[in-house]
Interface confidence: medium
């Protein structure tokens, strides 16, 4: 029977800069049952505070609500292990809200076949923000990537779309079935997950684009 | 409270043109993250899917029966229009509308209608 | 498009039997599964969504699990109120599409 092994803060998240969450990974439990607690203060402060909210991310994690969550001040974490042998602390993590935002997928994805007369086709989608991000405050840019393929095909061709909320494709294989996504990141953050996917049939008189 | 109510007519001949109108009410067409899709259950069958409209005015259609198929919103009436043409005693069926609502990970039909019952027959 | 594929497509069952449900999609749809209840003459009633969200009001006897192509709809005590139709829906992919149902009967 040992104290616990050094646990780890392994990922922060937000999905509007509104409320974060942290996770970490649990050492070694030594044989014995392990309690955990995060504390943390903002940076120049020394008054600690233990985590808000054990529960809603789920197991080893903690969650900071709207009124725990500060953009513009730098959060210094740790987690504290502890067993009938002794204690042990994770490396200190400085968490910036404002870098660790991963929003939700956009949402309300469409995809037509628009075949204009005086012009070539073209494959036309569009989308909406993710409903938790408010763009109207101007604290956001979301950014966004489309990816398709062919039903059959392995790989995926991907278009920036930088921060249009609908963008335009010419170059398709007629009479293939293609697959479309579409995801979203902030201008400081990481990508969200793929959107669901729509499947859009190319008509077979669809003329490709020189 | 959120409701939905189908109208149109309860019986058309082969050929013609159905149109029915869903009347919303508890939440607006324009709401980000709603729509209202077009459901149909022929006598004894199965739901299948038709079509559906988001709040950003994206449509979508049935594969099978996409030529057939229109639909649109008139938010400031509250109601979503689907029309579907030629039709044949094939498609008589109970067609519903429901709400759909997205949001974090999650897509689905959370209020239906109550169905207004086409019968397709000469 | 995805195909979704639920069986049994009938079942006779007691009340208080815990009764499972399974739905197989064509390709993998995450966990974008939806199940329904359905009385007859009655519209269709949102269960579960997300494959294993509760939507409110719905008895926790009711639960779902599962995510990729395979996925459970479990009633944990069947009620007589439970005796009813039950589908399954992907809303990975549009064009969505329902399963063929499960009819659930009183033994």
């Known amino acids: 029977q040992l104290p616990p092994g050094k646990p780890e803060i392994f990922k922060c998240r937000s999905p509007n800069k509104e409320t974060f969450t942290c996770w970490w990974r649990p050492g070694t439990d030594g044989g014995l049952p392990t309690n955990y607690s995060l504390t943390y203060h903002r940076e120049g402060e020394t008054l600690m505070h233990e985590c808000p909210d054990y529960i809603t991310g789920g197991p080893n994690s903690c969650h900071f609500g709207k009124q725990y969550t500060s953009m513009w001040r730098t959060y210094v974490m740790m987690v504290n292990a502890t067993n009938q042998m002794g204690s042990s602390f994770s490396d200190e993590l400085y968490v910036d809200v404002t870098y660790i935002v991963q929003p939700d997928p956009p949402l309300e994805l469409t995809v037509e076949v628009k075949q204009p007369e005086d012009r070539k086709p073209y494959l036309w989608m569009k989308w909406s923000p993710p409903t938790l991000i408010d763009l109207k405050t101007g604290w956001f840019t979301l950014l966004y990537e489309i990816r398709l393929k062919p039903e059959k095909a392995a790989e995926w061709e991907t278009h920036f779309a930088g921060q249009q909320t609908e963008f335009k494709i010419l170059s398709l294989h007629p009479g293939q079935k293609y697959l479309v996504q579409v995801r979203c990141k902030p201008d400081h953050g990481y990508w969200s997950a793929w959107s669901p996917a729509t499947f859009i049939q190319i008509p077979s008189d669809f003329i490709m684009n020189d | 409270q959120v409701t939905l109510k189908e109208s149109g007519p309860v019986l058309v001949k082969p050929t013609q043109t159905l149109s029915l109108t869903c009347t919303v009410s508890?939440?607006?067409?324009?709401?980000?993250?709603?729509?209202v899709s077009w459901i149909r259950q022929p006598p004894g069958k199965a739901l299948e899917w038709l079509a559906h409209?988001?709040?950003?005015?994206?449509?979508s259609y049935s594969t099978s029966l996409k030529s057939r198929l229109t639909i649109s919103k008139d938010t400031s009436k509250r109601q979503v229009v689907l029309t579907m043409t030629n039709m044949d005693p094939v498609d008589t069926a109970t067609y519903y509308c429901?709400?759909?609502?997205?949001?974090?990970?999650?897509?689905?039909?959370?209020?239906w209608g109550q169905g207004t019952l086409v019968t397709v027959s000469s | 498009d995805i195909q979704m594929t639920q069986s049994p497509s009938s079942l006779s069952a007691s009340v208080g039997d815990r009764v499972t449900i399974t739905c197989r999609a064509s390709q993998s749809i995450n966990s974008y599964l939806n199940w329904y209840q359905q009385k007859p003459g009655k519209a269709p009633k949102l269960l579960l969504y997300?494959?294993?969200s509760l939507q409110s009001g719905v008895p926790s006897r009711f639960s779902g699990s599962g995510s990729g192509t395979d996925f459970t709809l479990t009633i944990s005590s069947l009620q007589p109120e439970d005796f009813a139709s039950y589908y399954c829906?992907?809303?990975?992919?549009?064009?969505?599409?329902f399963g063929q149902g499960t009819k659930v009967e009183i033994k």
């Open positions: 508890g939440f607006s067409l324009s709401d980000a993250g709603m729509g």
């Open positions: 997300f494959a294993s």
């Open positions: 429901a709400r759909i609502r997205t949001g974090t990970y999650s897509l689905y039909l959370d209020y």
């Open positions: 829906q992907e809303s990975y992919s549009t064009p969505w599409t």
């Open positions: 409209i988001f709040s950003n005015d994206g449509k």
